[in-house]
């Protein structure tokens, strides 16, 4: 039975050219996290494997940095980075938990962080 929940950085606005940290946290479960995948739409951005460490997809190496923790840092943001991001926690014995973050990259200098929220 899957009892865990994923808390994310929620819905984020950020400035074009800036950087942002995407964070997810799995709680309310004793399951072991074996791997976390970060995806943008249908593209794999990065993998953090409990044994092998981080792997950043080659096409994102220049703009994606691992961490902090199991999070991901996106740099040199463009308007095209607007969209959904997913943290996919592979755990044992629970299975897979998925969190969602929606990022809006703004042309203007007005950018605020959204409130944190939970996804069951």
């Amino acid at each position: 039975m899957m009892t865990g929940t994923i808390e994310t950085t929620g819905n984020i606005s950020a400035e074009k050219g800036g950087s942002i940290i995407l964070q997810c946290h799995l709680s309310s479960t004793t399951a072991q996290v074996t791997q976390v995948n970060w995806e943008q739409q249908d593209q794999l951005l990065a993998i953090c494997n409990a044994d092998l460490g981080w792997h950043i997809s080659p096409s994102f190496k220049d703009r994606v940095a691992p961490g902090p923790g199991l999070g991901l840092t996106l740099q040199s943001l463009t308007v095209n980075d607007t969209g959904e991001y997913f943290c996919i926690y592979h755990t044992y014995p629970d299975g897979t938990y998925t969190g969602r973050i929606f990022l809006e990259v703004l042309e203007s200098s007005v950018a605020e962080h959204g409130a944190r929220f939970q996804i069951p």
Partner: nanobody, 125 residues
């Protein structure tokens, strides 16, 4: 309880166009992120397009970019999918889906709360 009813499907020749509609009732349509999904015979359901409740954000699967357009009319509680330059591989049952609330679009089926019964689109010469 939200009800979604799709219409507009049918048989069409390759290269032609169709417009699907999804009429919603029983809820606050203007606050719902919405999406279109499709399932071809023997294949898994896949995402086609999605739109935010405020119309600011849209998503398209790579296979339909430049050919399909998602839109909505919140005053009519209706979601649309304009499909141009149809191909044989677009043949599928098309479903609309709604989510109670949320920011931006939702491209993945797991996030949706309500589904229509589907409308069949057949592209054949």
């Amino acid at each position: 309880q939200v009800q979604l009813v799709e219409s507009g499907g049918g048989v069409v020749q390759p290269g032609r166009s169709l417009r699907l509609s999804c009429a919603a009732s029983g809820g606050s349509f203007s606050s719902y992120p919405m999406g279109w999904f499709r399932q071809a015979p023997g294949k898994e359901r896949e995402s086609v397009a999605a739109i935010s409740s405020d119309l600011r954000f849209t998503y398209y699967a790579d296979s339909v970019k430049g050919r399909f357009t998602i839109s909505r009319d919140n005053s009519k509680n209706t979601l649309y999918l304009q499909m141009n330059s149809l191909r044989a591989e677009d043949t599928a049952v098309y479903y609309c889906a709604a989510r109670e609330s949320g920011v931006g679009y939702y491209s993945r089926a797991q996030w949706y709360d309500y589904w229509g019964q589907g409308t069949l689109v057949t592209v054949s010469s």
